[in-house]
């Protein structure tokens, strides 16, 4: 099994308020087994945005077909963006367990929010 890499290709994304933001994340291996989660921010104050293991997350949809057994694309779309959504988003692989434990993080994608065009 190759060593898992988490690829967040976009260092930054800029979206107008009210629009949807697409945050890209792909993994290079299904191993170790465990869910993908997305967070805004880092450290103890980080905010959970999406957890593959549970839901729903009303404003978040996965971009690819995550029910495919071989799926390695965990990009998400966040709808109706507001200035409060600005921040750095991390795609993180967890290793299964009780509880699941963080295994590896992507480098992060900074989301900035532009004023809604008048």
């Amino acid at each position: 099994e190759e060593e898992l890499q988490i690829i967040q290709p976009d260092k930054s994304v800029s979206v107008a308020a009210g629009e949807s933001a697409i945050l890209h994340c792909t993994i290079t291996s299904l191993f170790p087994v465990g869910p993908i989660q997305w967070f805004r921010g880092a450290g103890p104050a980080r905010v959970l945005i999406y957890n593959q293991r549970q839901g729903p997350f009303p404003r978040v949809t996965t971009v690819s077909e995550t029910t495919k057994r071989e799926n390695m694309d965990f990009s998400i779309s966040i709808s109706n963006i507001t200035p409060a959504d600005a921040g750095t988003y991390y795609c993180i692989k967890f290793r299964k367990g009780s509880p699941d434990t963080e295994f590896k993080s992507g480098a992060g994608t900074e989301l900035s929010v532009r004023a809604k065009p008048s």
Partner: antibody
């Protein structure tokens, strides 16, 4: 409430074909992967095939080639086309909803397929 | 193949553990209850340790590597059934089941 109702079972002769259906309700069928699982008389559970929400298919090795899983998301219905049936295919066939990691959380009541000459 | 004992028995109120081995680190596990042959299975545990909302809290699951365990704390007469362990293997994209364990409540 999640409901899965299988139909299409019956008695067929060896070599014949049969198509099973599973009508789903109470959840977003088009967003969920689904599977067929069978149970021969006096035996345990055996996974037959699975299908992703968009139609990618996966089969147990022993079932590949003769069985075809499909779905119609507009009708909230899962199908299993079974060809060249043999006596060893006699079983109760269950449809099951898959979880995010391809285990099963809800099952139908099953439909009995009997292959006999 | 997943391996589980053919039968276990317990008195009402006791704690029952059913183990299932033969998986690997690439597996997730579930447990399914079948009260009579040919009746619809009921999932009591999925994703190693998750309980569906309608399943009593006396059912719990755990997993470590190649083994998963179903624990019934304070077993009741209505828990008498065949319990199947099931697994999904990420390395082969396939599901598998154990042969089933018959739980008898004395």
């Amino acid at each position: 409430d999640v409901q899965l109702v299988e139909s299409g079972g019956g008695v067929v002769r060896p070599g014949e074909s049969l198509r099973l259906s599973c009508a789903a309700s109470g959840f977003s069928f088009s967003s969920n992967a689904m599977s067929w699982v069978r149970q021969a008389p006096g035996k345990g559970l055996e996974w037959v095939a699975g299908i992703s929400a968009s139609g990618d298919t996966y089969y147990s090795g022993s079932m590949k080639g003769r069985f075809t899983i499909s779905r119609d998301n507009s009708k909230n219905t899962l199908y299993l086309q079974m060809n060249s049936l043999t006596a060893e295919d006699t079983a109760v066939y269950y449809c099951a909803r898959e979880t995010w990691n391809h285990l099963f959380d809800y099952w139908g009541l099953g439909t009995l397929v009997t292959v006999s000459s | 193949a997943l391996t589980q004992p053919a039968s276990v028995s317990a008195n009402p109120g006791e704690t029952v553990k059913i183990t299932c081995s033969g998986g690997s680190d690439s597996y997730y596990y579930g447990w399914h209850q079948q009260k009579s042959p040919g009746s619809a299975p009921v999932t009591v545990i999925y994703s190693d340790d998750q309980r569906p909302p309608d399943i009593p809290s006396r059912f719990s699951g755990s997993a470590s590597g190649s083994t998963t365990t179903l624990t019934i704390t304070g077993v009741r007469a209505e828990d008498e059934a065949v319990y199947y362990c099931g697994g999904y293997d990420y390395s082969t994209y396939t599901n598998t089941f154990g042969a089933g364990t018959t739980l008898t409540v004395l």
